[in-house]
């Protein structure tokens, strides 16, 4: 987790002057309670935005937005501690706004933005906005969290994005995978355009399982420069194992902007329908 | 999450042997195609030995014959056995499984002419 380099910071608007800093997620009202706090955010929204760096790297950031509750608890609103926190990792990034100058109602609702956080290909973020100062230990709770999703590299918007293409979205293998006679699968795909070595994992399971029963890697080499986006065949020979019958096939390149770390291409071959064997019809009808 | 460990690398002199181990942590191995490549200085990772779920074999065409991959499954270790080691021989030695897409951290081999 990090924040978007690309410029200084800014959360004061018309009628508010507003600083953001950076935040340990641990805001002094935690140790020093107050006896007057704020209410919680209103509507709380997070949707994703896509914000180049200066350097002109194009990146996924949650864009947060909130408004104030239309009570008198705005008099006592210091700031928000924005916080994102990665599921998966458990690691945590807070900023702080700080209010300069006091709120004041007026014809319209506060509303607050932040779009600085940097966010994963396909990780799922609990976004936490927190009026400041925080509630006295037994007080009602001001704040409002959400949970964010973001998709992976194989949505329209992230593929462009530089994270996504550092890990090989824009190369499409356009995998074909056919039963061949005698227990083998032919695996058709299109190379890149770099010189570098490819894995393809056949993975097998039984009609309606989800354990592997066979297991197979090969290796393709390094191709040449004249073999570009051309089409790389390979024939794979599967385990005569009956009811071995689900085969999954993944492709994973070793591209020098993502190494052992590419996103894999996978394609699926379903076991094959077995006819439907009609009831036998009995040679005589019983009487009873 | 699976980890590898691999060990038992180190300089030797041309013409001699060396034994690598992958222990493999979080998963048994018995039923994975495992992998052994290597990345010499300045160069691509390349793959060295192959071995399936099934027990078959797969090498380099450069290795035949020099390079044995088997495991262990009651251990659950992937060896290496290198026999007639060149200079040319000389890299990081990893260990792959490409299902769970784990690698260790790699153990240096030398070979000195």
């Known amino acids: 987790l990090r924040l978007l380099d690309h410029r200084a910071l800014v959360c004061s608007q018309p009628g508010l002057n507003c600083t953001v800093k950076n935040s340990t997620c641990l805001d002094d009202s935690w140790i020093h309670p107050r006896n007057l706090t704020p209410s919680s955010p209103k509507d709380l929204q997070i949707q994703l935005h896509f914000a180049h760096t200066q350097q002109g790297d194009l990146f996924p950031v949650a864009h947060i937005e909130w408004t104030l509750q239309t009570d008198a608890s705005i008099l006592y609103l210091e700031g928000a501690e924005l916080s994102v926190l990665q599921l998966n990792t458990n690691e945590r990034l807070c900023v702080r706004f700080e209010f300069l100058s006091k709120l004041r109602h007026h014809h319209r609702r506060w509303r607050f933005t932040f779009s600085h956080f940097v966010v994963d290909p396909d990780q799922e973020y609990e976004v936490t906005v927190h009026h400041l100062p925080k509630p006295i230990p037994d007080g009602d709770p001001n704040h409002q969290s959400k949970n964010f999703l973001v998709p992976d590299c194989e949505h329209a918007r992230m593929k462009v994005t530089t994270p996504c293409m550092s890990s090989g979205s824009l190369w499409d293998p356009n995998i074909t995978v056919e039963t061949l006679e005698a227990h083998q699968l032919r695996v058709s795909f299109t190379l890149w355009n770099e010189s570098t070595h490819y894995q393809i994992l056949l993975t097998s399971f039984p009609h309606m399982e989800n354990h592997s029963c066979f297991e197979h890697m090969h290796h393709i080499p390094a191709p040449r420069p004249e073999e570009f986006h051309q089409r790389s065949n390979v024939t794979l020979t599967l385990r005569n194992l009956k009811g071995c019958c689900r085969h999954q096939v993944q492709i994973q390149p070793f591209f020098s902007s993502c190494l052992n770390d590419c996103l894999r291409h996978s394609a699926t071959v379903s076991c094959p329908e077995m006819p439907d064997t009609p009831e036998p019809i009995p040679d005589y009808m019983p009487l009873w | 999450e699976v980890q590898l460990v691999e060990s038992g690398g180190g300089l030797v002199q041309a013409g001699g042997s060396l034994r690598l181990s992958c222990a493999a942590s979080g998963s048994t191995i018995s039923d994975r195609a495992t992998a052994w490549y290597r990345q010499a200085p300045g160069k691509q990772r390349d793959m060295v030995a192959t071995m399936n779920s099934a027990g078959n074999t797969n090498y380099a065409d450069t290795l035949k014959g020099r390079f044995t991959i088997s495991r262990d499954n009651a251990k659950n270790i992937v060896y290496l056995q290198m026999n007639s080691l060149k200079p040319e021989d000389t890299a990081v030695y990893y260990c792959?499984?490409?299902?769970?897409?784990?690698w260790g951290q790699g153990t240096q081999v030398t070979v000195s002419s």
């Open positions: 792959n499984i490409p299902y769970f897409n784990s």
